[in-house]
């Protein structure tokens, strides 16, 4: 029998390289059975995950999964960092793995770097 626990399918150690000024949708795949849980996004600041308030979010439904989406309209350099979604389910909090956004500020980049170049520049997270 399939578990009816809520599960959040953000891939462990996942990364996205994105560009300031572009729109971007960060998806949190959510599996649930009867009742859709309340889901929120937070941004990591050290070991603390700070809840994102007043941001544009939406739900997208697919065959076996729902997606809780955080919209960046547009991406800002300050959006660089790691994000996590969490679900409230039966008075428990279920947390996803974190996913990291590497943001390139196109104003300071002569040309858009490749994903490989972005992957080799983790210090962008701390700049």
């Amino acid at each position: 029998k399939e578990s009816c626990d809520v599960q959040l399918y953000i891939k462990r150690q996942s990364y996205h390289s994105i560009f300031a000024g572009d729109p971007f949708k960060l998806e949190c795949p959510v599996k649930y059975c009867a009742h859709r849980p309340q889901v929120t996004w937070c941004k990591l600041n050290g070991t603390t995950c700070v809840k994102l308030e007043g941001r544009h979010t939406s739900w997208k439904q697919e065959k076996n999964l729902s997606f809780f989406i955080l919209h960046f309209e547009p991406v800002l350099p300050s959006d660089n960092g790691s994000y996590r979604c969490s679900a409230n389910f039966l008075s428990a909090i279920i947390e996803s793995h974190s996913t990291t956004l590497y943001v390139t500020d196109v104003k300071s980049a002569s040309e858009r770097p490749s994903k490989d170049e972005m992957a080799s520049r983790p210090w962008l997270l701390y700049s």
């Epitope: 399918y9 996205h16 793995h97 974190s98 992957a119």
Partner: antibody, heavy 120, light 112 residues
Framework: QVQLQESGPGLVKPSGTLSLTCADS????????IHWVRQPPGKGLEWIGR????????RYNPSFKSRATISSDKSKNQASLKLSSVTAADTAVYYC?????????????WGQGTTVTVSS | DIVMTQSPDSLALSLGERATINCKSS???????????LNWFQQKPGQPPKRLIY???KLDSGVPDRFSGSGSGTDFTLTISSVQAEDVAVYYC?????????FGQGTKLEIK
């Protein structure tokens, strides 16, 4: 069932580029990570790198960083490895492997491997 | 890089004996999510590696229960309680916590 199959030329000339493909069936590659691992004759396993086919983001072993390029094609459900400026030291069996997802994140399924010899 | 050091490099045992393979990592493999991504693979000649154990001690489906894994932090052990002829292989530990991912150098198990 889940299957991975590597393919590519078995012989590559020194200073040339090794190009391999990993055809995946029985699962959707965008839901997983695909890794490349190699094994020189009589030696141990060496991790080359991985790709997230959902967005093309790669991570590499620094030993290969300047020479290895991993890519994927979601429409064909396959991943590829290119290794440039090869030498005899790159002669090995090359494997692709799937990293299963939540909650284990380990290399649960491997291709049979393809032998590549670097020789003129 | 995380260095994974296995010991011994090889061992020769009689059928029914207990095999113990150690794997030591140069840094803790405990991840931020509280899990330890240490895996054991078995590789027989001419075959790809096969996952035996994941998350330190979880046995893959179809793997005989004579295999077990234990450990934490930086020290891990693969145990075969009673070695069988079909266990002749090279065994590798692998860490999936840090980048780059790394394997141990392998331990060759033979039957005396």
């Amino acid at each position: 069932q889940v299957q991975l199959q590597e393919s590519g030329p078995g012989l590559v000339k020194p200073s040339g580029t090794l190009s391999l493909t990993c055809a995946d069936s029985g699962f959707n590659i965008k839901d997983t990570y695909i890794h490349w691992v190699r094994q020189p004759p009589g030696k141990g396993l060496e991790w080359i790198g991985r790709i997230d086919p959902a967005n093309g983001f790669t991570r590499y072993n620094p030993s290969f960083k300047s020479r290895a390029t991993i890519s994927s094609d979601k429409s064909k459900n396959q991943a590829s490895l290119k290794l440039s400026s090869v030498t005899a030291a790159d002669t090995a069996v090359y494997y692709c492997a799937r990293e299963d997802g939540y909650p284990y994140y380990t290399l649960d399924c491997w291709g049979q491997g393809t032998t590549v010899t670097v020789s003129s | 890089d995380i260095v994974m050091t296995q010991s011994p490099d090889s061992l020769a045992l009689s059928l029914g004996e207990r095999a113990t393979i150690n794997c030591k990592s140069s840094q803790s493999l405990l991840d931020v999510d509280g899990k330890t991504y240490l895996n054991w693979f078995q590789q027989k000649p001419g075959q790809p590696p096969k996952r035996l154990i994941y998350l330190v001690s979880k046995l893959d489906s179809g793997v005989p229960d004579r295999f077990s894994g234990s450990g934490s932090g930086t020290d891990f052990t693969l145990t075969i309680s009673s070695v069988q002829a079909e266990d002749v292989a090279v065994y590798y530990c692998w860490q999936g916590t840090h980048f780059p991912r790394t394997f141990g150098q392998g331990t060759k198990l033979e039957i005396k």
